[in-house]
Interface confidence: low
C-alpha cells in the first residue's frame, strides 16, 4: 500500500515566489521617464521574471521633513494620477502580479518617521491602509522601522487592519538592523509579518558563516514563514562581489521563505560601475542607451537586453530559478535540512513528502573544492542518494541533466549546484 500523502500547507500568494522591489520609479524606467503609466509597460518584463509581487514606491506626496505636506492618500503628480495607479493595478492583476505599496512616510527626508510626531504619522498610516486596501492593493511595506518608536505595537495594529480586510493581504516591515534579537522581538508580536532586514548582509565571507546565520535564523523563528534578502532596500551588489551574485541568487531562491529582490538584482546592477549614479538607486540598464552619460561604460552583458539573449547570463539564471521556485513543491513549502559538506561549503536539502527533492551545494570560497557531504547529519526522511541529476550550475560548462556521483562532487570557486533526485520510500 502506498504511504498516505502529507497534507499540503495553506499557501498564501507570497509563499509561491519572489517579490520585486521598485523603490525608485525614475531610476527603474530611466530616460527621464518614471511614472506609473510607464511602469505598466514594464509589467511584461516582470512577468518574464516570474515574480509574484511588485513592491512599489513610496509614490505618495512627501515634502521633505514636512508632516503637513506629506499625504499618504495622494500620489505625487510626478509619478502620475490615481487613475494611472488604478490602471496599473488592473494590468498587474491580469498578469497575476500583486502590488504592494510602500507607505514609508518621510521617504524624501532625514527621518523616515518624523521622529517628533510619531502619533500623527501613525494615524496617517492607518487612514492610508484603509484607503489603499479599498483601492485594491495587495499589501504594504514600511521601512526603517528602527526609527519608529513602539514599532511592535504600531505594526500589530497595522497588521490587524491589513489582515482584517483580507487574509490575502500582506504587510512587510523593513529594518536596517542585522541583530537577530532585535529582529526576533519585532517578529514575536506580529504573527504574519514579513520582515526584511540586513541580517544576511555580512554573510558573504564563508560558507560556514552563512550556514550558521541561516540555521540560527530558522531555528529561532520556528515554523513561521520567513523572507530572504540582504537588506530592506538595497541592491545585492551593495554587499556582494560580482562572483558571489549567482551563488546568492541560487541560495535566496532555494531557502524556505520568500526571496525579496530589488530591481536590477537579476542583472547584477551595480551603482559602482555607473559613475555619478546614486548607490541606493542607480538607473536600470535596459540596454546600452540607458546610461548615456558615459558612452561605452555600459556593455551589452550588463543590460537586460544583452543578458536576455545569453542563456548563460545572470538574468537567465534568475529566470530559471524563479521558475523552479514557483512550481516545485519541495521548493515551495518543503522541509529544510542543512548539513556539513566541508570547509567553505554550505549545503542543504529541500524535500516535501513524495515529491522530487533538491540538494543545494554552495562553494563560497575562491578555490575549487571537493564536497564531503555528511549524510549522517540528515534525518532518515531526508537521506541522500548515491547520485543526483544536475538541474543547474551557477557556472557555465557543466552538462545539465547528467547524474553526478555525490561522493565525488567537486565544485569550482564560487560555484553553486542545484541537484534533483526522486523520493525513495
Amino acid at each position: 500500500r502506498a504511504p498516505r500523502c502529507r497534507e499540503l500547507p495553506a499557501q498564501k500568494w507570497w509563499h509561491t515566489g519572489a517579490l520585486y522591489r521598485i523603490g525608485d520609479l525614475q531610476a527603474f524606467q530611466g530616460h527621464g521617464a518614471g511614472n506609473l503609466a510607464g511602469l505598466k509597460g514594464r509589467l511584461d518584463y516582470l512577468s518574464s521574471l516570474k515574480v509574484k509581487g511588485l513592491v512599489l514606491g513610496p509614490i505618495h506626496k512627501n515634502q521633505k521633513d514636512d508632516v503637513a505636506q506629506t499625504d499618504l492618500l495622494q500620489i505625487d503628480p510626478n509619478f502620475g494620477s490615481k487613475e494611472d495607479f488604478d490602471s496599473l493595478l488592473q494590468s498587474a492583476k491580469k498578469k497575476s502580479i500583486r502590488v504592494i505599496l510602500d507607505l514609508t512616510p518621510n521617504y524624501r527626508g532625514e527621518n523616515s518617521w518624523f521622529s517628533t510626531q510619531v502619533d500623527t504619522v501613525a494615524t496617517k498610516v492607518k487612514d492610508a491602509l484603509e484607503f489603499w486596501l479599498q483601492a485594491g492593493v495587495d499589501g504594504f511595506q514600511v521601512r526603517d522601522i528602527e526609527n519608529l518608536k513602539d514599532a511592535s505595537s504600531f505594526l500589530a495594529e497595522w497588521q490587524n487592519i491589513t489582515k482584517g480586510f483580507s487574509e490575502d493581504r500582506l504587510l512587510i516591515a523593513g529594518t536596517n538592523s542585522s541583530d537577530l534579537q532585535q529582529i526576533l522581538s519585532l517578529l514575536e508580536s506580529n504573527k504574519d509579518l514579513l520582515l526584511t532586514s540586513s541580517y544576511l548582509s555580512d554573510s558573504g565571507s564563508t560558507g560556514e558563516h552563512t550556514k550558521s546565520l541561516v540555521t540560527q535564523y530558522l531555528n529561532a523563528t520556528g515554523n513561521r514563514w520567513c523572507s530572504w534578502s540582504l537588506s530592506q532596500a538595497r541592491l545585492l551588489t551593495s554587499f556582494l562581489p560580482a562572483q558571489l551574485l549567482r551563488l546568492y541568487q541560487l541560495m535566496l531562491f532555494t531557502l524556505p521563505g520568500t526571496p525579496v529582490f530589488s530591481y536590477g538584482d537579476e542583472i547584477g546592477l551595480d551603482a559602482a560601475a555607473l559613475p555619478g549614479q546614486p548607490m541606493e538607486a542607480p538607473v536600470m540598464l535596459w540596454d546600452e542607451s540607458s546610461f548615456p552619460d558615459i558612452p561605452g561604460a555600459v556593455s551589452a552583458n550588463m543590460t537586460v537586453k544583452g543578458q536576455s539573449e545569453d542563456p548563460g547570463s545572470l538574468l537567465s539564471l534568475f529566470r530559471r530559478l524563479s521558475d523552479q521556485r514557483s512550481k516545485e513543491r519541495s521548493l515551495l513549502h518543503g522541509d529544510f535540512h542543512a548539513f556539513s559538506a566541508g570547509p567553505g561549503l554550505f549545503s542543504y536539502i529541500r524535500h516535501w513528502d513524495q515529491n522530487e527533492r533538491f540538494l543545494v551545494v554552495l562553494n563560497f570560497g575562491d578555490v575549487g573544492l571537493s564536497a564531503g557531504l555528511q549524510a549522517s547529519d540528515l534525518p532518515a526522511s531526508a537521506s541522500l542518494p548515491a547520485k543526483a541529476d544536475l538541474l543547474l550550475s551557477t557556472q557555465p560548462g557543466r552538462e545539465e541533466g547528467s547524474p553526478l556521483e555525490l561522493e565525488r562532487l567537486k565544485l569550482e570557486p564560487h560555484e553553486g549546484l542545484l541537484l534533483r533526485f526522486p523520493y525513495a520510500a
Partner: antibody
Framework: EVQLQESGPSLVKPSQTLSLTCSVT????????WNWIRKFPGNKLEYMGY???????YYNPSLKSRVSITRDTSKNQYYLQLNSVTTEDTATYYC?????????????WGQGTLVTVSA | QIVLTQSPAIMSASPGEKVTISCSAS?????MYWFQQKPGSSPKPWIY???ILASGVPDRFSGSGSGTSYSLTISSMEAEDAATYYC?????????FGAGTKLELK
C-alpha cells in the same frame, strides 16, 4: 539618412571668436549626443564636447574656459563657439553624432570645415 | 583622461602582406573603436566593440584586445586599405583618440 553639415567662416583672426553651425537632417537633436571634434594639421583628433538631447553640455577640460556649445531645436542646429583663438586652433572642425546601442555603433560625421586662424 | 597611444605612426605594406596596428590605453577600457579616414573624406566607423566590423568593412579586417592593449589587423593588405586608422575610446569623458597610423601601400 542622417546628415550633418558644418558652416562658418574659414578664416578667423587671433583673439577673436570662432563660430560654427552644424545643421542636422534625418535626425532630431532632441535625441542623443551631438559632438564637436577637431583635427589638427598633424592629423591629431581632439574631442571638444557635446550637447545632449536635453541641452546639457560637456566640454573637454583642456578647452573649458573658451568653449561653448548651444543649440536651436526649432532649426535642428547646434553651434560651437571658441573664444580667444590662437594659431594653435587652426584645424578641420567636424560635427558628429554617435550612437552606441547594444551591438550597434553609428558615428555620423559632417564633411568638416577647415578654419584657419591667421592675422 | 585616458591617453591612447597608437603604433606605428606610419607604415607601409605590400599587397598581400599582413598588417597589425596597435593601440595602447593609459588605463583599462571595456572596448576599443576604430575609424578609417582617407584624405579629403570624413572618418568612417570601421571596427566597434573591439572586434565587430562596421557595415561594409571587408572581412580581411579584424580587431582584438582587452584591458589596455588593442589591435587592428589586416590579414592581406589591398590597395584600397591605404588610409589613416584611428583608435577611440568611449569609456570616459573626454572621449579620446589615438594619434593615428598612416598606412601606405608599398
Amino acid at each position: 539618412e542622417v546628415q550633418l553639415q558644418e558652416s562658418g567662416p574659414s578664416l578667423v583672426k587671433p583673439s577673436q571668436t570662432l563660430s560654427l553651425t552644424c545643421s542636422v537632417t534625418g535626425d532630431s537633436i532632441t535625441s542623443g549626443y551631438w559632438n564637436w571634434i577637431r583635427k589638427f594639421p598633424g592629423n591629431k583628433l581632439e574631442y571638444m564636447g557635446y550637447i545632449s538631447y536635453s541641452g546639457r553640455t560637456y566640454y573637454n577640460p583642456s578647452l573649458k574656459s573658451r568653449v561653448s556649445i548651444t543649440r536651436d531645436t526649432s532649426k535642428n542646429q547646434y553651434y560651437l563657439q571658441l573664444n580667444s583663438v590662437t594659431t594653435e586652433d587652426t584645424a578641420t572642425y567636424y560635427c558628429q553624432r554617435h550612437v552606441i546601442y547594444d551591438y550597434t555603433w553609428f558615428a555620423y560625421w559632417g564633411q568638416g570645415t577647415l578654419v584657419t586662424v591667421s592675422a | 583622461q585616458i591617453v591612447l597611444t597608437q603604433s606605428p605612426a606610419i607604415m607601409s605594406a605590400s599587397p598581400g602582406e599582413k598588417v597589425t596596428i596597435s593601440c595602447s590605453a593609459s588605463s583599462s577600457v571595456h572596448y576599443m573603436y576604430w575609424f578609417q579616414q582617407k584624405p579629403g573624406s570624413s572618418p568612417k566607423p570601421w571596427i566597434y566593440r573591439t572586434s565587430i566590423l562596421a557595415s561594409g568593412v571587408p572581412d580581411r579586417f579584424s580587431g582584438s584586445g582587452s584591458g589596455t592593449s588593442y589591435s587592428l589587423t589586416i590579414s592581406s593588405m589591398e590597395a584600397e586599405d591605404a588610409a589613416t586608422y584611428y583608435c577611440q575610446q568611449y569609456q570616459s569623458y573626454p572621449l579620446t583618440f589615438g594619434a593615428g597610423t598612416k598606412l601606405e601601400l608599398k
